[in-house]
């Protein structure tokens, strides 16, 4: 948690003497007003408790680690919520103090309530000046609950909040109806994000077991220690009159911490300093009690005496919270003989020790080869050992050598030496080598000579198009294998660089020198050949082509078909994106148009030689469909068709086309030309007996016209299998065979 304390001076006889001070013990604080990081902010928060406007409050800064608020002119100025904000970035933290008027109608039995998720919170407002009217409870300034004045129990109005959740946190108030809000009892409810003894996302982690009234932070599992206590589990008491995470701050004034309220980051809230209690923190602890708000009991054994600031003071040879443990020589446990770190990293080194008295954070130290002594930043206290964690400053090569962990207690001391090897992350001395290239991929050999230390654990290849500002693409590869960079753009230069890593945190070396590798795109050399084309309608053309057979892979991405309309001076281009395609259907052409057609293979943006051109005449729009088509079976192999000529013909009919298909058959239909356009009847011969056929027909002038309706007819039975249908025409008027 952030080392931030908001102190309120509660000597309230004169509001002008009242002050609030916010003190930061964070690293970087205390270096003057230009210290790194955002400044401390201390302000009255009028969002929930609004007070009548008065002269502005005065803010005085003492460097960057302390700020004080003064200038309170009347008691009502003091009532409400004050907040101090400190810490940088993600550690920025707000500490809140709630001030109640001593002359209020209702007073809180306890201002700060810290509860666990799912607990029942009970806020108790004590009647100080009775009014025979309802009591309104509010949460964060909004109405919450009403109590009839008869509902007071033993002169107290209670608000029970069952199964509280983190959103229930905030400022609560109890106010008599018709009374001024300044006469309210104000409370602060802090709901930890986890159940008792748990912390972390999903609340799966177990709290360390905070001592002396410390509260486990639900986000990081650290103990927020009451003022006057320190250590990872708040196991150590500060000297009288001191506070802060490392006991580094001193209470102002000659009477120490008397009359001061201390507010710390959530989920702790506020309390008196160690050794003091009462609504104004002016009362010393009763005998046998100690700590913040005098909430702790000494219960000293083996001749220990109770100190109201620190608890039991043990005689020689004894230690422990109640002087219940005898001393023995400390011992360092399970220290590795050799450790390896990468240059410029800031590793954490752990050193575990046991003994009686139990080693605490301050009793374990780490010594570097140059004699520098590091103090632990954190200690994990377990029943059988204390593990001190040291945050090592950025390593340099000179840090290689023998380090020493030392533990000292009143029971004696112990030390262990271990070797630290500082390794240099590898940096490539040369660029990667290009092995082969294709239009869309490059094969690269990444492993090159390097400076620094091995072994190489990973190789990263960074690449992007030359002169591009886009992000680098990265591929992580096995050090022993060649790398294929895929999905590249053809005929494009790529800047390629290698980055090597060795095992361990901070093992990534700097990027090696870049090299330029260009993807390939050979010109397609094969000339396609137009095999044929087929008019499928007045505006549709089916084209087919071939390529010469050559050994090796086909160099090409697809085909480009070009149609040139010389009359209109227009070119139509059709892209066929598969190099395997050998046919294409061109639609939306202009009927009755003479086109020149060719096809060529393309690769990337390069075009191969064009095929010899073909000249294609698209028929103009065809005539309307023949009318009243009718089919009549004549025998087991003959069916006669009759029809009427189309109406509104644009010119003379050159022929009719009849389509014959077996009903329900899967084969292709058969087309039969009727070459005498004056005919209105024809006989289709050579059909199979007892077979149902489908017929339709269309006329042709310069192009084929629309199909007529389809008619069905069956041949008669008992015939032999015919060789296939043929046609014979007749003029319907004459009734003669042709």
């Amino acid at each position: 948690a952030v080392d931030l304390t908001l102190l309120a001076n509660l000597r309230l006889t004169d509001p002008q003497r009242f002050f609030l001070t916010c003190v930061s013990g964070e690293a970087g604080a205390g270096r003057g007003s230009d210290a790194w990081g955002p400044p401390l902010l201390l302000e009255k928060d009028d969002r929930i408790v609004r007070t009548p406007p008065g002269p502005p409050l005065r803010l005085a800064r003492n460097g960057s680690h302390q700020v004080t608020l003064r200038g309170f002119s009347k008691p009502s100025d003091l009532v409400g919520v004050f907040s101090c904000v400190g810490g940088a970035g993600a550690r920025r933290t707000r500490v809140i103090y709630v001030h109640n008027s001593p002359g209020a109608h209702l007073l809180p039995d306890k201002v700060t309530h810290t509860v666990n998720k799912g607990d029942t919170a009970v806020l108790s407002a004590r009647v100080h000046k009775e009014k025979q009217t309802d009591v309104i409870w509010k949460s964060n300034g909004s109405y919450f609950y009403t109590l009839d004045w008869h509902e007071a129990q033993d002169g107290r109005f209670l608000l029970q909040l069952p199964n509280v959740q983190p959103p229930s946190s905030g400022i609560y108030s109890a106010t008599y109806l018709e009374a001024s809000p300044l006469g309210s009892a104000f409370f602060r409810l802090i709901v930890r994000g986890c159940g008792a003894g748990r912390w972390g996302p999903g609340c799966t982690k177990e709290c360390p077991g905070c001592l002396h009234g410390g509260v486990c932070h639900d986000h990081d599992g650290e103990c927020v220690c009451p003022p006057g206590f320190t250590g990872t589990r708040c196991e150590q008491a500060c000297r009288e009159g001191r506070f802060g995470q490392s006991c580094q701050e001193q209470c102002p004034g000659i009477s120490g911490c008397r009359g001061l309220t201390f507010c710390l980051p959530d989920p702790y809230g506020c309390s008196c300093g160690s050794g003091w209690r009462g609504s104004q923190c002016q009362e010393a602890c009763a005998p046998g009690h100690f700590g913040a708000d005098c909430r702790l009991q000494c219960q000293c054994q083996n001749g220990g005496t109770c100190d109201r600031f620190s608890g039991c003071v043990c005689p020689s040879g004894w230690h422990g919270v109640h002087c219940e443990k005898s001393d023995r020589i400390p011992q360092i446990l399970n220290m590795a003989s050799e450790l390896e770190f990468n240059l410029e990293t800031m590793p954490r080194i752990n050193c575990a020790a046991a003994g009686n008295p139990f080693p605490v954070r301050g009793s374990i130290e780490l010594r570097k080869p140059d004699g520098t002594v590091l103090l632990s930043t954190k200690a994990i206290v377990e029943p059988e050992k204390t593990t001190a964690e040291f945050e090592v400053p950025r390593l340099v090569l000179a840090d290689s050598g023998f380090w020493e962990c030392r533990v000292s207690t009143s029971g004696g001391q112990d030390s262990r030496r271990f070797k630290v090897n500082v390794k240099v992350p590898p940096v490539p001395l040369a660029a990667p080598r290009l092995l082969t290239k294709q239009s869309r991929q490059l094969v690269v050999s990444p492993l090159v000579s390097f400076s620094g230390d091995g072994p190489i654990s990973t190789v990263r290849l960074h690449y992007r198009p030359q002169d591009s500002t886009m992000d680098w693409s990265t591929i992580v590869v096995d050090p022993s294998e060649n790398v294929t960079l895929m999905n590249l753009r053809p005929k494009t230069g790529y800047s390629v660089r290698v980055q090597l890593s060795r095992p361990g945190e901070g093992g990534e070396g700097a990027w090696g020198p870049p090299t330029l590798m260009t993807t390939d795109c050979p010109e397609p050399l094969l000339q396609p050949w137009l095999e044929g084309w087929h008019v499928e309608g007045t505006d549709r053309l089916r084209v087919s082509w071939s390529l010469p057979l050559v050994p090796g892979p086909l160099v090409g991405d697809g085909f480009l078909l070009r149609l040139w309309d010389g009359t209109r001076g227009q070119e139509r281009r059709e892209n066929v994106s598969s190099p395997q395609a050998r046919t294409a259907l061109l639609t939306g052409l202009t009927p009755g148009t003479h086109y020149q057609l060719d096809v060529q293979l393309y690769h990337c943006t390069l075009l191969g030689p064009a095929s010899p051109p073909a000249h294609v005449l698209l028929p103009p729009s065809g005539p309307p469909a023949p009318r009243h088509l009718h089919a009549q079976a004549l025998s087991d192999s003959e069916i006669q068709l009759t029809w009427k000529h189309p109406e509104a013909l644009p010119g003379p009919i050159s022929k009719y086309v009849v389509e014959v298909q077996v009903a329900g058959g899967a084969g292709d239909p058969l087309w039969i030309d009727v070459d005498r356009p004056e005919e209105t009847s024809t006989i289709i011969r050579g059909l199979n007996a007892s077979t149902r056929y489908l017929f339709r027909m269309r006329a042709s002038i310069q192009g084929l016209g629309d199909w007529s309706n389809t008619v069905e007819e069956s041949t008669l039975g008992n015939g032999l299998q015919a060789e296939g249908p043929v046609q014979e025409s007749r003029a319907a008027e004459e009734g003669l065979d042709q």
Partner: antibody
């Protein structure tokens, strides 16, 4: 939307009983002071009874004391008025209303907001 | 109990005119606990003013309340057609009491 919906009114003979219900929605019913107000045909408004959120404290107008009982079921978000020994002068439109605390002039005060649409009780032989 | 007396019983005015409604308490009441309601035929009452002078949410600015002690006033600065209704004042000491109402009708 905050809403109150009364039901249970109807025609009843003198000396008979009736139970009115008021279903609340759109707010945390269990936190609010609730009440019944009635209005005889062509007359003004008359406060009948009130009940505190806990349900433990109830108050009645002198005209209904001993005959009417106000209650609430916070789990069902419902307010009730049990009317016994009904008289002809109890004939009225019965409204339920929420008592909403408002901040003004540096203190907290009450007003009836919102009201239900009412349910008609007719006591006649 | 405190009695609330409203006057006049009926007020006949035209749209656009100013309406002044009076409410007198039989003894001094806390102005924080005085409210005004509007009731139209066939509808439930609607809160207009609370704490003697504070407009409820959604109430137009032409409605205003004033007064203290025993005398309170509701003013409608310029009557709109939808303002013709019955208006009640109400107070709360130990219990709630309403005035008998003032009917504002179209002249």
């Amino acid at each position: 939307e905050v809403q109150l919906l009364e039901s249970g009114g109807g025609l009843v003979q003198p000396g008979g009983s009736l139970r009115l219900s008021c279903a609340a929605s759109g707010f945390t019913f269990s936190r609010y002071l609730m009440m019944w107000v009635r209005q005889a045909p062509g007359k003004g408004l008359e406060w009948v009874s009130s009940i505190y959120p806990s349900g433990g404290w109830t108050y009645y107008a002198d005209s209904v004391k001993g005959r009417f009982t106000i209650s609430r079921d916070n789990s069902k978000n419902t307010l009730y008025l049990q009317m016994n020994s009904l008289r002809a002068e109890d004939t009225a439109m019965y409204y339920c209303a929420r008592v909403a605390p408002y901040d003004s002039s540096g203190s907290v005060n009450y007003a009836f907001d919102p009201w239900g649409q009412g349910t008609l009780v007719t006591v006649s032989s | 109990d405190i009695q609330m007396t409203q006057s006049p019983g009926t007020l006949s005015l035209s749209p656009g005119e100013r309406a002044t409604l009076s409410c007198r308490a039989s003894q001094s009441v806390n102005s924080n606990q005085l409210a005004w309601y509007q009731q139209k035929p066939g509808q439930a009452p609607r809160l207009l003013i609370y704490g003697a002078s504070n407009r409820a949410t959604g109430i137009p600015a032409r409605f205003s309340g004033s007064g203290s002690g025993t005398d309170f006033t509701l003013t409608i600065s310029s009557l709109e057609p939808e303002d013709f209704a019955v208006y009640y004042c109400q107070q709360r000491s130990n219990f709630w009491t309403f005035g008998q109402g003032t009917k504002v009708e179209i002249k």
